[in-house]
């Protein structure tokens, strides 16, 4: 078998809402993956599991099942959404995300994704991790790759 390539492209959109009373931020983050099948037979993308971390804390998880079948030597772009919640011990972020003197309220999130593919009863898992900027102050649609956090070091948070 040849490789199945998974490329995390970036954040496609982030939609934000707030619970004013609870000082809680809700971010629905839609990400884009490119999955390439380099084989001469079809493979099934069985599931995608994703999680988002802020400051080493998991703030959201998602799982998609029975997603698609990718034909021989084909590539498919798949969007998946992770609902995230920034609350409780991180409620100090509420003041940052709702601060009116700032134009862009970028926070650095770590996106983790694992893609499980199957072919002829064989299962394969491919994982990726990326740091991404997300604006927690307004609804934002990104050009693909625009939200990438290029610093290879863990950001101070």
């Amino acid at each position: 078998p040849r490789s199945i390539d998974v490329k995390y492209i970036g954040v496609k959109s982030a939609y934000v809402s707030y619970d004013v009373q609870k000082r809680t931020i809700y971010l629905n983050i839609t990400n884009t993956l490119n999955i390439t099948n380099n084989n001469y037979y079809s493979v099934e993308v069985e599931n995608i599991t994703a999680q988002v971390q802020f400051s080493k804390t998991v703030i959201g998880k998602a799982r998609l099942n029975n997603i698609t079948i990718i034909g021989p030597l084909d590539m498919k772009q798949i969007d998946y959404t992770v609902p995230t919640v920034i609350a409780e011990e991180m409620s100090y972020m509420y003041d940052f995300c709702t601060l009116i003197s700032i134009k862009v309220h970028n926070i650095v999130l770590m996106m983790q994704v694992t893609v499980t593919t199957t072919y002829f009863g064989h299962s394969e898992q491919i994982s990726q991790e990326r740091y991404q900027y997300v604006d927690c102050g307004r609804n934002t649609t990104y050009q693909l790759g625009q939200s990438e956090y290029l610093n290879v070091l863990q950001p101070q948070q």
Epitope: Y18, V20, F96
Partner: antibody
Framework: EVQLQQSGAELMRPGASVKLSCTAS????????MYWVKQRPEQGLEWIGR????????EYAPKFQGKATMTADTSSNTAYLQLSSLTSEDTAVYYC???????????????WGQGTSVTVSS | DVLMTQIPLSLPVSLGDQASISCRSS???????????LEWYLKKPGQSPKLLID???NRFSGVPDRFSGSGSGTDFTLKISRVEAEDLGVYYC?????????FGGGTKLEIK
């Protein structure tokens, strides 16, 4: 240290113009809106307007439209307030302000200059 | 413009008393993001204004817990539970929800 340093007191003649400066240290003004506030002697605070230093886009309270002009120079990290056609009504202390993120933990700080006194007298 | 009206203009108190200042906006000051940017400042002579409360009731860092803010819609209140000498000065409410932002007329807290 995060702070705003304003230019010194001005004594001006009626009809003249004056340009006040507000220099930021400890943060980049292009990341924030900068605000200007007026306080006349024995009077209350008045919001003059705000400027986005990155593109120079400014919004004014109607009362100060035509009287005040806000500009900014990101290379010197300085915001400016120009007041034209000065009258005794412009005698006041003028403050610049903003609210900034002052550390890597996203904590906010309300930041004000010390104020610049402008006296208009013949 | 949003007009901010403060009551009273002057508030004579004895040290240790509770003080209450009212602020009313001429229209609702809920921002498009759902937050209400109603703030309270203390201004002392010769000093820059100091932020006490933002978003109606959120005490700013370093502000003593004797200060509290409340309200909703168009009616807001600042309470000082036990007035101390350092609390004397002029208090201003401020709305930062709709441009142009506006201050209230101020309330002078003074010794009775």
């Amino acid at each position: 240290e995060v702070q705003l340093q304003q230019s010194g007191a001005e004594l001006m003649r009626p009809g003249a113009s004056v340009k006040l400066s507000c220099t930021a240290s400890g943060f980049n003004i292009q990341d924030y809106y900068m605000y200007w506030v007026k306080q006349r002697p024995e009077q209350g605070l008045e919001w003059i307007g705000r400027i986005d230093p990155e593109d120079g886009d400014a919004e004014y309270a109607p009362k100060f439209q035509g009287k005040a002009t806000m500009t900014a120079d990101t290379s010197s990290n300085t915001a400016y307030l120009q007041l034209s056609s000065l009258t005794s009504e412009d005698t006041a202390v003028y403050y610049c302000s903003t609210r900034v993120i002052y550390d890597g933990y996203y904590r906010t700080m309300d930041c004000w200059g010390q104020g610049t006194s402008v006296t208009v007298s013949s | 413009d949003v007009l901010m009206t403060q009551i009273p203009l002057s508030l004579p108190v004895s040290l240790g008393d509770q003080a209450s200042i009212s602020c009313r906006s001429s229209q609702t000051i809920v921002h498009s993001n759902g937050n209400t940017y109603l703030e309270w400042y203390l201004k002392k002579p010769g000093q820059s204004p100091k932020l006490l409360i933002d978003k109606i009731s959120n005490r700013f860092s370093g502000v003593p817990d004797r200060f509290s803010g409340s309200g909703s819609g168009t009616d807001f209140t600042l309470k000082i539970s036990r007035v101390e000498a350092e609390d004397l000065g002029v208090y201003y409410c401020f709305q930062g929800s709709h441009v142009p932002y506006t201050f209230g007329g101020g309330t002078k807290l003074e010794i009775k």
